[in-house]
């Protein structure tokens, strides 16, 4: 803490500008008035402060607004936002979009701190959903963004957000978090022709129950190994031999690459040797044939 | 051993039809397509076509559609290629490869002469 | 059909050099492609599949990369059994064409 000392003569801060960088910390403190540096924070980042500097100002501000700043002056920060702390940050209530740009583009290029963290979610929270612009701007800024919430998070996301989703988006995240945003990508993306409905929700399939795969199938959709090996592997193994030739089309010819990795070994496994032999690759491991297949769970469902 | 036989040579008159064979051993011959490819002397390798032998699906370079056939007998695990109307630019190596091009038959040397 | 083409058309390096012969396709084909060595009056010989798996029993010094539609093979400190011919072939659906081939010859 700084100890509050008189300002010298002639030295009172009239507005914020360079002459300050002179200042030693005892004088900032006594010479800067907190209400002038609110209302000239935008000013601030075009001043190269020390960090000593800058611990001074976001000083002041604090004193000034204790219970947190107003959004007027969060816009504003730059990089004095990279002073504060979550607990400062929690204080916050920001609404604005190009409040929280303003923020993001100081972090811009480094990992999500847990400053930046708090900020997104104090900004989400206050929307009360992830809206298509605020995804937008995240997965702008954070492409893993969306990978890092959890499935209860991501239950929030309204389905018309997931046009603001990229393929690269989606590259960190698990199957069950595709579990929850398949369906909305599937309500989405609805009313697209086949072609382009592939297109859209191809990212999302890893949270495709079997069903959907096998009317994929129907549409001569070339699906590629790179997708195919994200599927969940239980919507796989039901899908027969004709239905994942068709499924994969010319990349068929991938799954011999891939006979020893989840989910083409367990699938080679389900099926009749016969039935693989059709595809021509060389696959092995099927059911010899001549042998019965008892569908156990089914048993178990009966009983 | 795995292999594929093909006979080292044959000699055809102009505007004859000859059956090439090639026969597979040591694996599934069910498992793969069989592939043909043809080289002329001092060439390059020009792919023909290729037949599943479990499905008999059979796809074809176009350029060789009206006059190539393909063939297996699974008995025996043999594919043929079957060449009608032969000319001279029919003089060249034929291959049969299997799918996974590990395997190549030693090659049959056409030549068409009168 | 894919045109699949191969440059340079012939090539002559020494013993211990490095070289690369690449492969072109005309529209995408992911990472089916396939390279071959052969030598005359032989049959080819399969040195890489999916672009860049190495075959069975061929030496490390060859390696293969690519996708999409650019592709290429290098070969590391020549040997004298690496003179021959080299072909790519796409894997991707069919008609499978071949490149025109690269001649490598000893300097």
């Known amino acids: 803490e700084v100890e509050k000392t008189a300002c010298p003569s002639g030295k009172k801060a009239r507005e914020i500008d360079e002459s300050l960088i002179f200042y030693k910390k005892w004088e900032l403190e006594a010479c800067v008035d907190a209400a002038l540096l609110a209302t000239q924070m935008d000013r601030v980042n075009a001043i190269p402060f020390t960090y000593e500097q800058l611990d001074v100002l976001k000083h002041k501000l604090d004193e000034l607004y204790p219970q947190g700043y107003p959004e007027s002056v969060i816009q504003h920060l730059g990089y004095l936002f990279l002073k504060m702390s979550p607990e400062d940050i929690r204080k916050w209530n920001v609404t604005s979009l190009e409040t929280l740009k303003a923020l993001l583009e100081v972090n811009k290029g480094h990992e999500m701190s847990p400053q930046v963290a708090t900020l997104i979610d104090r900004f989400v929270k206050g929307r009360g959903q992830l809206d298509k612009d605020t995804l937008d701007t995240l997965t702008a800024f954070y492409p893993g963004y969306l990978c890092s919430l959890s499935p209860e998070e991501l239950s929030s996301v309204p389905p018309s957000s997931i046009w603001a989703v990229r393929p690269q988006d989606l590259d960190t995240c698990d199957p069950r978090q595709l579990d929850v945003l398949y369906p909305k990508a599937r309500l989405a993306f609805q009313n697209m022709n086949g072609s382009e409905y592939f297109v859209k929700i191809q990212s999302f399939l890893g949270g495709a129950p079997t069903e959907d795969l096998k009317a994929l199938s129907q549409q001569n959709v070339s699906m590629d190994l790179a997708t195919f090996m994200k599927l969940r592997t239980d919507a796989v193994l039901p899908l027969t031999v004709a239905e994942v030739q068709k499924l994969l089309g010319p990349h068929v010819e991938g799954l011999k690459a891939e006979e020893r990795h989840r989910p083409v070994r367990d699938w080679i496994l389900r099926q009749r040797q016969d039935d693989l032999d059709t595809l021509g690759l060389g696959l092995q491991g099927g059911i010899p044939n001549g042998y019965l297949v008892l569908d156990l769970s089914m048993q178990e469902a009966l009983s | 051993q795995v292999q594929l036989q093909q006979p080292g040579t044959e000699l055809v008159k102009p505007g004859a039809s000859v059956r090439l064979s090639c026969r597979a051993s040591?694996?599934?011959?069910?498992?793969?397509?069989m592939h043909w490819v043809k080289q002329r002397p001092g060439q390059g390798l020009e792919w023909l076509g290729n037949?599943?032998?479990?499905?008999?699906?059979?796809n074809y370079n176009e350029k060789f559609r009206n006059r190539a056939t393909l063939a297996v007998d699974k008995s025996s695990t043999t594919a043929y290629l079957q060449l009608t109307s032969l000319t001279s630019e029919d003089s060249a190596v034929y291959f049969c490869?299997?799918?996974?091009?590990?395997?190549w038959g030693q090659g049959t040397t056409l030549t068409v002469s009168s | 059909d894919i045109q699949m083409t191969q440059s340079p058309a012939s090539l002559s390096a020494s013993v211990g050099e490095t070289v690369t012969i690449t492969c072109r396709a005309s529209?995408?084909?992911?990472?089916?492609l396939a390279w071959y060595q052969q030598k005359q009056g032989k049959s080819p010989q399969l040195l890489v599949y999916?672009?860049?798996t190495l075959a069975e029993g061929v030496s490390s010094r060859f390696s293969g990369s690519g996708s999409g539609t650019q592709f290429s093979l290098k070969i590391n400190s020549l040997q004298p059994e690496d003179f021959g011919t080299y072909y790519c072939?796409?894997?991707?659906?069919?008609?499978?064409?071949f490149g025109g081939g690269t001649k490598l010859e000893i300097r």
């Open positions: 037949i599943n032998p479990t499905t008999g699906d059979i």
């Open positions: 999916y672009a860049k």
């Open positions: 040591g694996y599934s011959f069910s498992s793969y397509w």
């Open positions: 529209e995408n084909i992911y990472s089916y």
């Open positions: 072939q796409h894997q991707f659906g069919t008609p499978r064409t």
């Open positions: 490869v299997r799918h996974d091009g590990f395997l």
